[in-house]
Amino acid sequence: GASSAGLGPVVRCEPCDARALAQCAPPPAVCAELVREPGCGCCLTCALSEGQPCGIYTERCGSGLRCQPSPDEARPLQALLDGRGLCVNASAVSRLRAYLLPAPPAPGNASESEEDRSAGSVESPSVSSTHRVSDPKFHPLHSKIIIIKKGHAKDSQRYKVDYESQSTDTQNFSSESKRETEYGPCRREMEDTLNHLKFLNVLSPRGVHIPNCDKKGFYKKKQCRPSKGRKRGFCWCVDKYGQPLPGYTTKGKEDVHCYSMQSK
Protein backbone atom coordinates (compact mmCIF):
# COMPACT_ATOMS: atom_id res chain seq x y z
CA GLY A 1 0.00 0.00 0.00
CA ALA A 2 0.94 3.65 -0.10
CA SER A 3 2.18 3.70 3.45
CA SER A 4 4.64 0.87 2.95
CA ALA A 5 8.08 1.70 4.24
CA GLY A 6 10.24 3.32 1.63
CA LEU A 7 7.41 4.34 -0.67
CA GLY A 8 6.39 7.94 -1.13
CA PRO A 9 3.03 9.26 -2.26
CA VAL A 10 1.35 7.88 -5.35
CA VAL A 11 -1.23 9.63 -7.48
CA ARG A 12 -4.86 8.56 -7.51
CA CYS A 13 -6.63 9.17 -10.82
CA GLU A 14 -10.36 9.31 -11.35
CA PRO A 15 -11.46 5.87 -12.56
CA CYS A 16 -12.04 5.46 -16.28
CA ASP A 17 -15.59 4.19 -16.00
CA ALA A 18 -17.91 3.48 -18.91
CA ARG A 19 -19.37 6.98 -18.70
CA ALA A 20 -15.91 8.56 -19.01
CA LEU A 21 -15.03 6.27 -21.93
CA ALA A 22 -18.30 7.11 -23.66
CA GLN A 23 -17.16 10.73 -23.81
CA CYS A 24 -14.14 9.79 -25.92
CA ALA A 25 -13.95 10.33 -29.65
CA PRO A 26 -12.86 7.41 -31.83
CA PRO A 27 -9.06 7.57 -32.08
CA PRO A 28 -7.31 8.43 -35.35
CA ALA A 29 -7.18 5.54 -37.81
CA VAL A 30 -3.62 6.38 -38.87
CA CYS A 31 -1.89 5.53 -35.56
CA ALA A 32 0.72 2.80 -35.46
CA GLU A 33 -0.21 2.35 -31.79
CA LEU A 34 -2.86 3.76 -29.50
CA VAL A 35 -2.22 4.76 -25.89
CA ARG A 36 -4.16 6.61 -23.22
CA GLU A 37 -3.99 10.39 -23.25
CA PRO A 38 -1.51 12.10 -20.91
CA GLY A 39 -2.04 12.38 -17.18
CA CYS A 40 -5.36 11.00 -16.00
CA GLY A 41 -6.88 10.97 -19.48
CA CYS A 42 -9.20 8.05 -20.29
CA CYS A 43 -9.32 8.42 -24.06
CA LEU A 44 -6.98 7.03 -26.70
CA THR A 45 -4.52 8.87 -28.87
CA CYS A 46 -1.53 8.07 -31.08
CA ALA A 47 1.59 6.92 -29.27
CA LEU A 48 4.87 8.71 -29.91
CA SER A 49 7.52 6.62 -31.63
CA GLU A 50 11.21 6.19 -30.81
CA GLY A 51 13.21 9.41 -31.12
CA GLN A 52 10.17 11.71 -31.03
CA PRO A 53 10.17 14.62 -28.56
CA CYS A 54 8.07 14.01 -25.46
CA GLY A 55 7.34 15.40 -22.05
CA ILE A 56 4.97 15.45 -19.14
CA TYR A 57 2.27 17.31 -21.07
CA THR A 58 2.66 15.48 -24.39
CA GLU A 59 1.26 12.23 -25.73
CA ARG A 60 2.83 9.07 -24.30
CA CYS A 61 5.68 7.11 -25.82
CA GLY A 62 4.76 3.78 -27.40
CA SER A 63 5.29 0.27 -26.08
CA GLY A 64 8.78 -0.42 -24.80
CA LEU A 65 9.70 3.27 -24.84
CA ARG A 66 10.25 5.77 -22.05
CA CYS A 67 10.34 9.55 -22.11
CA GLN A 68 13.81 10.51 -20.98
CA PRO A 69 15.52 13.89 -20.73
CA SER A 70 18.86 14.11 -22.50
CA PRO A 71 21.71 12.81 -20.26
CA ASP A 72 23.51 16.15 -20.36
CA GLU A 73 20.35 18.10 -19.43
CA ALA A 74 21.12 20.51 -16.58
CA ARG A 75 17.46 20.66 -15.48
CA PRO A 76 15.83 17.32 -16.35
CA LEU A 77 12.52 18.14 -14.67
CA GLN A 78 12.23 21.41 -16.56
CA ALA A 79 13.14 19.59 -19.78
CA LEU A 80 10.24 17.18 -19.26
CA LEU A 81 7.91 20.05 -18.38
CA ASP A 82 8.93 21.80 -21.60
CA GLY A 83 8.51 18.67 -23.73
CA ARG A 84 12.23 18.38 -24.44
CA GLY A 85 12.53 14.71 -23.58
CA LEU A 86 12.95 11.95 -26.14
CA CYS A 87 11.18 8.60 -26.48
CA VAL A 88 13.96 6.07 -25.99
CA ASN A 89 14.15 2.30 -25.61
CA ALA A 90 12.96 1.44 -22.09
CA SER A 91 15.45 -1.38 -21.55
CA ALA A 92 18.32 0.99 -22.29
CA VAL A 93 16.83 3.47 -19.80
CA SER A 94 16.51 0.74 -17.16
CA ARG A 95 20.12 -0.29 -17.60
CA LEU A 96 21.22 3.32 -17.23
CA ARG A 97 19.06 3.75 -14.14
CA ALA A 98 20.34 0.55 -12.58
CA TYR A 99 23.85 1.87 -13.04
CA LEU A 100 23.18 5.42 -11.83
CA LEU A 101 20.44 4.84 -9.24
CA PRO A 102 20.64 1.34 -7.79
CA ALA A 103 17.32 0.68 -6.04
CA PRO A 104 15.28 -2.38 -5.07
CA PRO A 105 12.50 -3.12 -7.57
CA ALA A 106 9.14 -1.58 -6.71
CA PRO A 107 6.39 -4.04 -5.79
CA GLY A 108 3.94 -4.95 -8.53
CA ASN A 109 6.28 -4.21 -11.41
CA ALA A 110 6.78 -7.79 -12.47
CA SER A 111 3.56 -8.17 -14.43
CA GLU A 112 2.99 -4.89 -16.21
CA SER A 113 0.02 -4.89 -18.55
CA GLU A 114 0.32 -3.68 -22.13
CA GLU A 115 -1.23 -0.41 -21.04
CA ASP A 116 1.41 0.05 -18.33
CA ARG A 117 4.27 -0.75 -20.65
CA SER A 118 3.13 1.77 -23.18
CA ALA A 119 2.75 4.50 -20.63
CA GLY A 120 6.27 5.89 -20.77
CA SER A 121 8.38 6.92 -17.82
CA VAL A 122 6.63 10.21 -17.22
CA GLU A 123 3.44 8.40 -16.33
CA SER A 124 2.92 5.74 -13.70
CA PRO A 125 -0.28 3.71 -13.87
CA SER A 126 -3.25 5.21 -12.15
CA VAL A 127 -4.09 3.74 -8.79
CA SER A 128 -7.82 3.43 -9.14
CA SER A 129 -8.23 2.90 -12.86
CA THR A 130 -11.10 0.47 -13.30
CA HIS A 131 -9.96 -1.01 -16.56
CA ARG A 132 -6.50 -2.23 -15.71
CA VAL A 133 -6.15 -5.94 -15.99
CA SER A 134 -3.08 -6.36 -13.82
CA ASP A 135 -4.14 -3.48 -11.54
CA PRO A 136 -0.87 -3.04 -9.69
CA LYS A 137 -2.55 -0.56 -7.29
CA PHE A 138 0.55 1.34 -6.20
CA HIS A 139 3.09 1.21 -8.94
CA PRO A 140 5.77 3.87 -8.45
CA LEU A 141 8.43 4.62 -11.02
CA HIS A 142 11.99 3.43 -10.56
CA SER A 143 13.37 6.78 -11.56
CA LYS A 144 13.06 8.52 -8.19
CA ILE A 145 12.11 11.89 -9.60
CA ILE A 146 9.30 14.27 -8.83
CA ILE A 147 6.95 14.53 -11.75
CA ILE A 148 4.16 16.93 -12.55
CA LYS A 149 1.56 15.73 -14.96
CA LYS A 150 -1.15 17.47 -16.89
CA GLY A 151 -3.90 15.40 -18.49
CA HIS A 152 -5.86 16.96 -21.31
CA ALA A 153 -9.62 16.78 -21.15
CA LYS A 154 -10.37 18.62 -24.37
CA ASP A 155 -8.35 21.80 -23.63
CA SER A 156 -8.59 21.63 -19.88
CA GLN A 157 -5.77 20.97 -17.50
CA ARG A 158 -5.71 18.43 -14.74
CA TYR A 159 -2.57 17.98 -12.72
CA LYS A 160 -1.20 15.23 -10.61
CA VAL A 161 2.11 14.74 -8.87
CA ASP A 162 4.13 11.61 -8.25
CA TYR A 163 6.61 11.43 -5.43
CA GLU A 164 9.26 8.83 -4.88
CA SER A 165 10.51 7.93 -1.44
CA GLN A 166 13.57 8.94 0.52
CA SER A 167 14.92 10.37 -2.67
CA THR A 168 18.22 12.17 -2.90
CA ASP A 169 16.76 13.82 -5.98
CA THR A 170 14.27 15.61 -3.74
CA GLN A 171 17.15 17.52 -2.24
CA ASN A 172 18.61 18.04 -5.70
CA PHE A 173 15.30 19.51 -6.80
CA SER A 174 15.27 21.89 -3.86
CA SER A 175 18.83 23.02 -4.44
CA GLU A 176 18.00 23.50 -8.09
CA SER A 177 15.24 25.90 -7.06
CA LYS A 178 17.74 27.84 -4.93
CA ARG A 179 19.94 28.23 -7.99
CA GLU A 180 16.96 29.58 -9.91
CA THR A 181 15.70 32.38 -7.69
CA GLU A 182 15.59 34.57 -10.76
CA TYR A 183 12.60 32.51 -11.92
CA GLY A 184 9.22 34.19 -11.74
CA PRO A 185 6.44 33.93 -9.16
CA CYS A 186 4.61 31.08 -10.90
CA ARG A 187 7.66 28.85 -10.79
CA ARG A 188 8.12 29.67 -7.11
CA GLU A 189 4.48 28.85 -6.35
CA MET A 190 4.84 25.57 -8.22
CA GLU A 191 7.94 24.63 -6.22
CA ASP A 192 6.31 25.63 -2.94
CA THR A 193 3.36 23.40 -3.82
CA LEU A 194 5.67 20.51 -4.68
CA ASN A 195 7.64 20.92 -1.48
CA HIS A 196 4.41 21.04 0.52
CA LEU A 197 3.08 17.94 -1.21
CA LYS A 198 6.28 16.10 -0.28
CA PHE A 199 4.70 15.41 3.11
CA LEU A 200 1.47 13.94 1.76
CA ASN A 201 1.14 10.24 1.15
CA VAL A 202 -1.55 9.70 -1.49
CA LEU A 203 -2.35 12.61 -3.75
CA SER A 204 -5.65 13.26 -5.45
CA PRO A 205 -4.96 14.88 -8.82
CA ARG A 206 -8.10 16.96 -8.34
CA GLY A 207 -7.16 18.04 -4.84
CA VAL A 208 -4.31 20.34 -5.75
CA HIS A 209 -3.84 23.22 -8.15
CA ILE A 210 -0.41 23.50 -9.71
CA PRO A 211 -0.12 26.71 -11.70
CA ASN A 212 0.50 26.83 -15.42
CA CYS A 213 3.91 28.49 -15.82
CA ASP A 214 5.85 29.71 -18.82
CA LYS A 215 9.54 28.94 -19.35
CA LYS A 216 10.62 32.01 -17.42
CA GLY A 217 8.54 31.02 -14.41
CA PHE A 218 5.80 33.59 -14.89
CA TYR A 219 2.11 32.71 -15.10
CA LYS A 220 0.70 31.70 -18.45
CA LYS A 221 -2.34 33.68 -19.48
CA LYS A 222 -4.75 30.79 -19.03
CA GLN A 223 -5.11 28.97 -15.71
CA CYS A 224 -7.52 26.10 -15.09
CA ARG A 225 -8.77 24.09 -12.17
CA PRO A 226 -8.40 20.33 -12.55
CA SER A 227 -10.92 18.51 -14.69
CA LYS A 228 -12.89 15.36 -14.05
CA GLY A 229 -12.80 12.77 -16.82
CA ARG A 230 -13.62 14.71 -19.97
CA LYS A 231 -15.41 17.47 -18.03
CA ARG A 232 -13.58 20.78 -18.28
CA GLY A 233 -12.36 22.50 -15.16
CA PHE A 234 -13.09 26.13 -14.37
CA CYS A 235 -10.64 28.37 -16.30
CA TRP A 236 -9.65 32.00 -15.93
CA CYS A 237 -7.16 34.50 -17.31
CA VAL A 238 -4.32 36.07 -15.36
CA ASP A 239 -1.50 38.52 -15.90
CA LYS A 240 2.12 37.38 -15.74
CA TYR A 241 2.11 37.76 -11.96
CA GLY A 242 -0.93 35.54 -11.51
CA GLN A 243 -3.47 38.28 -10.84
CA PRO A 244 -6.89 37.35 -12.24
CA LEU A 245 -8.14 39.51 -15.09
CA PRO A 246 -11.84 40.35 -14.72
CA GLY A 247 -14.35 39.24 -17.32
CA TYR A 248 -12.47 36.19 -18.55
CA THR A 249 -13.80 33.00 -16.96
CA THR A 250 -15.59 29.85 -17.99
CA LYS A 251 -17.55 27.33 -15.98
CA GLY A 252 -16.55 24.61 -18.40
CA LYS A 253 -19.14 24.87 -21.16
CA GLU A 254 -17.08 26.99 -23.53
CA ASP A 255 -13.38 27.66 -23.78
CA VAL A 256 -11.94 30.82 -22.26
CA HIS A 257 -9.74 32.87 -24.57
CA CYS A 258 -6.96 34.92 -23.02
CA TYR A 259 -5.01 35.68 -26.19
CA SER A 260 -5.34 39.45 -26.29
CA MET A 261 -3.85 40.06 -22.88
CA GLN A 262 -0.25 41.00 -22.15
CA SER A 263 0.77 38.27 -19.74
CA LYS A 264 3.45 36.35 -21.55
Epitope: A22, C24, A25, P26, P28, L34, L44, E114, E115, S118
Partner: antibody, heavy 116, light 108 residues
Framework: QVQLVQSGAEVKKPGASVKVSCKAS????????ISWVRQAPGQGLEWMGW????????TYAKKFQGRVTLTTDTSTSTAYMELRSLTSDDTAAYYC?????????WGQGTLVTVSS | ETTLTQSPGTLSLSPGERATLSCRAS???????LAWYQQKPGQPPRLLIF???SRATGIPDRFSGSGSGTDFTLTISRLEPEDFGVYYC?????????FGQGTKVEIK
Protein backbone atom coordinates in the same frame (compact mmCIF):
# COMPACT_ATOMS: atom_id res chain seq x y z
CA GLN B 1 -32.39 8.64 -16.91
CA VAL B 2 -30.45 8.54 -20.18
CA GLN B 3 -32.62 7.76 -23.18
CA LEU B 4 -32.05 7.65 -26.94
CA VAL B 5 -35.27 7.53 -28.94
CA GLN B 6 -35.06 6.85 -32.67
CA SER B 7 -37.47 7.59 -35.51
CA GLY B 8 -39.75 4.91 -36.94
CA ALA B 9 -39.18 2.19 -39.53
CA GLU B 10 -38.61 3.19 -43.17
CA VAL B 11 -39.13 1.43 -46.50
CA LYS B 12 -37.02 2.80 -49.35
CA LYS B 13 -36.39 2.06 -53.01
CA PRO B 14 -32.86 1.25 -54.26
CA GLY B 15 -30.95 4.44 -55.08
CA ALA B 16 -32.93 6.51 -52.57
CA SER B 17 -31.70 8.09 -49.31
CA VAL B 18 -32.87 7.65 -45.74
CA LYS B 19 -32.49 9.96 -42.76
CA VAL B 20 -32.85 8.49 -39.28
CA SER B 21 -33.12 10.64 -36.15
CA CYS B 22 -32.05 9.93 -32.58
CA LYS B 23 -33.34 12.19 -29.79
CA ALA B 24 -31.30 12.16 -26.60
CA SER B 25 -32.45 13.04 -23.09
CA UNK B 26 -31.28 12.62 -19.51
CA UNK B 27 -27.74 13.96 -19.99
CA UNK B 28 -25.85 16.95 -21.38
CA UNK B 29 -25.99 16.26 -25.11
CA UNK B 30 -22.89 18.27 -26.01
CA UNK B 31 -20.68 16.29 -23.60
CA UNK B 32 -21.03 13.00 -25.48
CA UNK B 33 -20.72 12.00 -29.09
CA ILE B 34 -23.14 9.69 -30.87
CA SER B 35 -22.09 6.64 -32.88
CA TRP B 36 -24.21 4.86 -35.44
CA VAL B 37 -24.08 1.06 -35.62
CA ARG B 38 -26.05 -1.10 -38.02
CA GLN B 39 -27.14 -4.73 -37.92
CA ALA B 40 -28.36 -6.62 -40.97
CA PRO B 41 -31.05 -9.25 -40.26
CA GLY B 42 -29.50 -12.17 -38.38
CA GLN B 43 -26.06 -10.60 -38.63
CA GLY B 44 -23.53 -8.93 -36.34
CA LEU B 45 -22.89 -5.28 -35.46
CA GLU B 46 -21.10 -2.84 -37.75
CA TRP B 47 -19.88 0.60 -36.65
CA MET B 48 -20.65 3.28 -39.24
CA GLY B 49 -19.37 6.52 -37.75
CA TRP B 50 -19.40 9.01 -34.90
CA UNK B 51 -20.28 12.68 -34.42
CA UNK B 52 -19.40 14.85 -31.44
CA UNK B 53 -22.33 16.18 -29.43
CA UNK B 54 -21.37 19.75 -30.27
CA UNK B 55 -21.51 18.94 -34.02
CA UNK B 56 -17.84 19.86 -34.49
CA UNK B 57 -16.18 16.55 -35.35
CA UNK B 58 -17.16 13.50 -37.34
CA THR B 59 -15.40 10.20 -38.00
CA TYR B 60 -16.66 7.70 -40.55
CA ALA B 61 -15.87 4.05 -41.16
CA LYS B 62 -14.07 3.69 -44.52
CA LYS B 63 -16.84 1.50 -45.88
CA PHE B 64 -19.43 4.28 -45.47
CA GLN B 65 -17.31 7.33 -46.24
CA GLY B 66 -18.92 9.51 -48.87
CA ARG B 67 -22.28 7.77 -48.55
CA VAL B 68 -23.22 8.60 -44.99
CA THR B 69 -23.59 12.02 -43.33
CA LEU B 70 -23.91 12.48 -39.59
CA THR B 71 -25.25 15.70 -38.11
CA THR B 72 -26.64 16.94 -34.82
CA ASP B 73 -29.07 19.63 -33.78
CA THR B 74 -27.86 20.76 -30.36
CA SER B 75 -30.98 22.86 -29.77
CA THR B 76 -33.14 19.72 -29.77
CA SER B 77 -30.44 17.25 -28.60
CA THR B 78 -31.01 15.20 -31.74
CA ALA B 79 -28.52 13.31 -33.91
CA TYR B 80 -29.21 12.39 -37.52
CA MET B 81 -27.80 9.76 -39.85
CA GLU B 82 -28.38 10.08 -43.58
CA LEU B 83 -27.44 7.18 -45.86
CA ARG B 84 -27.52 7.69 -49.62
CA SER B 85 -27.56 5.46 -52.71
CA LEU B 86 -29.33 2.67 -50.88
CA THR B 87 -29.12 -0.94 -52.07
CA SER B 88 -30.76 -4.10 -50.74
CA ASP B 89 -27.56 -4.73 -48.74
CA ASP B 90 -28.43 -1.69 -46.63
CA THR B 91 -31.53 -3.40 -45.24
CA ALA B 92 -30.76 -3.42 -41.52
CA ALA B 93 -31.61 -2.12 -38.08
CA TYR B 94 -29.77 1.15 -37.52
CA TYR B 95 -28.86 2.04 -33.95
CA CYS B 96 -27.61 5.25 -32.44
CA UNK B 97 -25.43 4.75 -29.36
CA UNK B 98 -23.82 7.15 -26.92
CA UNK B 99 -20.03 7.17 -27.16
CA UNK B 100 -17.15 6.96 -29.59
CA UNK B 101 -15.21 3.91 -28.41
CA UNK B 102 -17.48 2.27 -25.83
CA UNK B 103 -21.25 2.52 -26.19
CA UNK B 104 -23.01 2.77 -22.85
CA UNK B 105 -26.56 3.62 -24.01
CA TRP B 106 -28.35 2.62 -27.22
CA GLY B 107 -31.43 3.72 -29.09
CA GLN B 108 -34.17 1.14 -29.73
CA GLY B 109 -33.17 0.83 -33.39
CA THR B 110 -34.74 1.86 -36.68
CA LEU B 111 -35.45 -0.80 -39.27
CA VAL B 112 -34.67 0.38 -42.80
CA THR B 113 -35.90 -1.91 -45.56
CA VAL B 114 -34.63 -1.35 -49.09
CA SER B 115 -36.84 -3.04 -51.66
CA SER B 116 -37.93 -2.38 -55.19
CA GLU C 1 -8.39 -3.77 -39.07
CA THR C 2 -8.56 -6.13 -36.09
CA THR C 3 -10.83 -9.14 -36.66
CA LEU C 4 -12.57 -10.69 -33.66
CA THR C 5 -13.62 -14.34 -33.78
CA GLN C 6 -16.10 -15.56 -31.19
CA SER C 7 -16.61 -19.18 -30.18
CA PRO C 8 -18.66 -21.20 -29.92
CA GLY C 9 -21.25 -19.93 -32.38
CA THR C 10 -24.03 -21.29 -30.18
CA LEU C 11 -23.99 -22.42 -26.57
CA SER C 12 -26.92 -24.54 -25.34
CA LEU C 13 -27.15 -24.48 -21.55
CA SER C 14 -29.68 -24.74 -18.74
CA PRO C 15 -30.39 -22.08 -16.11
CA GLY C 16 -27.96 -22.40 -13.23
CA GLU C 17 -25.12 -23.62 -15.46
CA ARG C 18 -21.87 -21.78 -16.11
CA ALA C 19 -21.32 -20.19 -19.52
CA THR C 20 -17.87 -19.50 -20.95
CA LEU C 21 -17.68 -17.41 -24.13
CA SER C 22 -14.45 -16.83 -26.02
CA CYS C 23 -13.29 -13.92 -28.17
CA ARG C 24 -10.03 -14.15 -30.10
CA ALA C 25 -8.42 -11.16 -31.84
CA SER C 26 -6.39 -11.32 -35.04
CA UNK C 27 -3.79 -9.09 -33.36
CA UNK C 28 -3.06 -8.08 -29.78
CA UNK C 29 -5.70 -5.71 -28.41
CA UNK C 30 -3.81 -2.65 -27.20
CA UNK C 31 -4.36 -1.84 -23.53
CA UNK C 32 -6.86 -4.71 -23.25
CA UNK C 33 -9.47 -2.35 -24.64
CA LEU C 34 -12.20 -4.93 -25.12
CA ALA C 35 -15.90 -4.72 -24.32
CA TRP C 36 -18.75 -7.25 -24.18
CA TYR C 37 -22.40 -6.57 -25.05
CA GLN C 38 -25.57 -8.60 -24.59
CA GLN C 39 -28.42 -8.46 -27.09
CA LYS C 40 -31.84 -10.00 -26.71
CA PRO C 41 -34.21 -10.48 -29.67
CA GLY C 42 -35.82 -7.22 -30.80
CA GLN C 43 -33.68 -5.16 -28.42
CA PRO C 44 -30.54 -3.05 -28.78
CA PRO C 45 -27.25 -4.30 -27.36
CA ARG C 46 -26.42 -3.59 -23.71
CA LEU C 47 -22.91 -2.88 -22.43
CA LEU C 48 -21.78 -5.51 -19.91
CA ILE C 49 -18.00 -5.30 -19.63
CA PHE C 50 -15.36 -2.77 -20.72
CA UNK C 51 -11.58 -2.76 -20.37
CA UNK C 52 -11.73 -6.58 -20.61
CA UNK C 53 -12.76 -7.02 -16.97
CA SER C 54 -14.70 -4.02 -15.58
CA ARG C 55 -18.45 -4.39 -15.20
CA ALA C 56 -20.64 -1.57 -16.47
CA THR C 57 -23.06 0.11 -14.06
CA GLY C 58 -25.94 -2.13 -13.01
CA ILE C 59 -24.46 -5.35 -14.38
CA PRO C 60 -24.79 -8.27 -11.92
CA ASP C 61 -21.58 -9.79 -10.59
CA ARG C 62 -22.34 -13.17 -12.16
CA PHE C 63 -20.90 -11.59 -15.32
CA SER C 64 -17.11 -11.40 -15.40
CA GLY C 65 -14.56 -10.68 -18.09
CA SER C 66 -10.95 -11.76 -18.29
CA GLY C 67 -8.07 -12.15 -20.70
CA SER C 68 -5.41 -10.06 -22.37
CA GLY C 69 -3.52 -9.78 -25.64
CA THR C 70 -5.49 -11.79 -28.17
CA ASP C 71 -7.61 -14.06 -25.97
CA PHE C 72 -10.57 -12.85 -23.94
CA THR C 73 -13.34 -14.61 -22.05
CA LEU C 74 -16.78 -13.66 -20.78
CA THR C 75 -18.01 -15.91 -17.99
CA ILE C 76 -21.56 -16.07 -16.64
CA SER C 77 -21.14 -17.96 -13.39
CA ARG C 78 -24.75 -19.09 -13.04
CA LEU C 79 -27.13 -18.56 -15.92
CA GLU C 80 -30.42 -16.86 -15.15
CA PRO C 81 -33.41 -17.11 -17.53
CA GLU C 82 -32.89 -13.46 -18.55
CA ASP C 83 -29.26 -14.12 -19.61
CA PHE C 84 -30.19 -15.95 -22.79
CA GLY C 85 -29.43 -14.01 -25.97
CA VAL C 86 -26.51 -13.10 -28.21
CA TYR C 87 -23.21 -11.81 -26.82
CA TYR C 88 -20.80 -9.68 -28.82
CA CYS C 89 -17.23 -8.70 -28.05
CA UNK C 90 -15.87 -5.39 -29.34
CA UNK C 91 -12.30 -4.11 -29.43
CA UNK C 92 -11.54 -0.41 -29.22
CA UNK C 93 -7.75 -0.60 -28.92
CA UNK C 94 -7.23 0.03 -32.62
CA UNK C 95 -9.15 2.12 -35.09
CA UNK C 96 -11.73 1.39 -36.33
CA UNK C 97 -13.34 -0.43 -33.43
CA UNK C 98 -14.70 -3.81 -34.51
CA PHE C 99 -17.21 -6.35 -33.22
CA GLY C 100 -17.12 -10.13 -33.17
CA GLN C 101 -19.81 -12.07 -35.02
CA GLY C 102 -21.54 -13.03 -31.76
CA THR C 103 -22.19 -16.11 -29.62
CA LYS C 104 -25.78 -17.19 -29.09
CA VAL C 105 -26.56 -18.52 -25.61
CA GLU C 106 -29.77 -20.53 -25.85
CA ILE C 107 -31.85 -22.57 -23.42
CA LYS C 108 -31.10 -26.28 -23.63
Amino acid sequence: QVQLVQSGAEVKKPGASVKVSCKASGYTFSDYGISWVRQAPGQGLEWMGWISGDNVKTTYAKKFQGRVTLTTDTSTSTAYMELRSLTSDDTAAYYCARGGIVFDYWGQGTLVTVSS
Amino acid sequence: ETTLTQSPGTLSLSPGERATLSCRASQSVSGNYLAWYQQKPGQPPRLLIFGASSRATGIPDRFSGSGSGTDFTLTISRLEPEDFGVYYCQQYGSSPGTFGQGTKVEIK
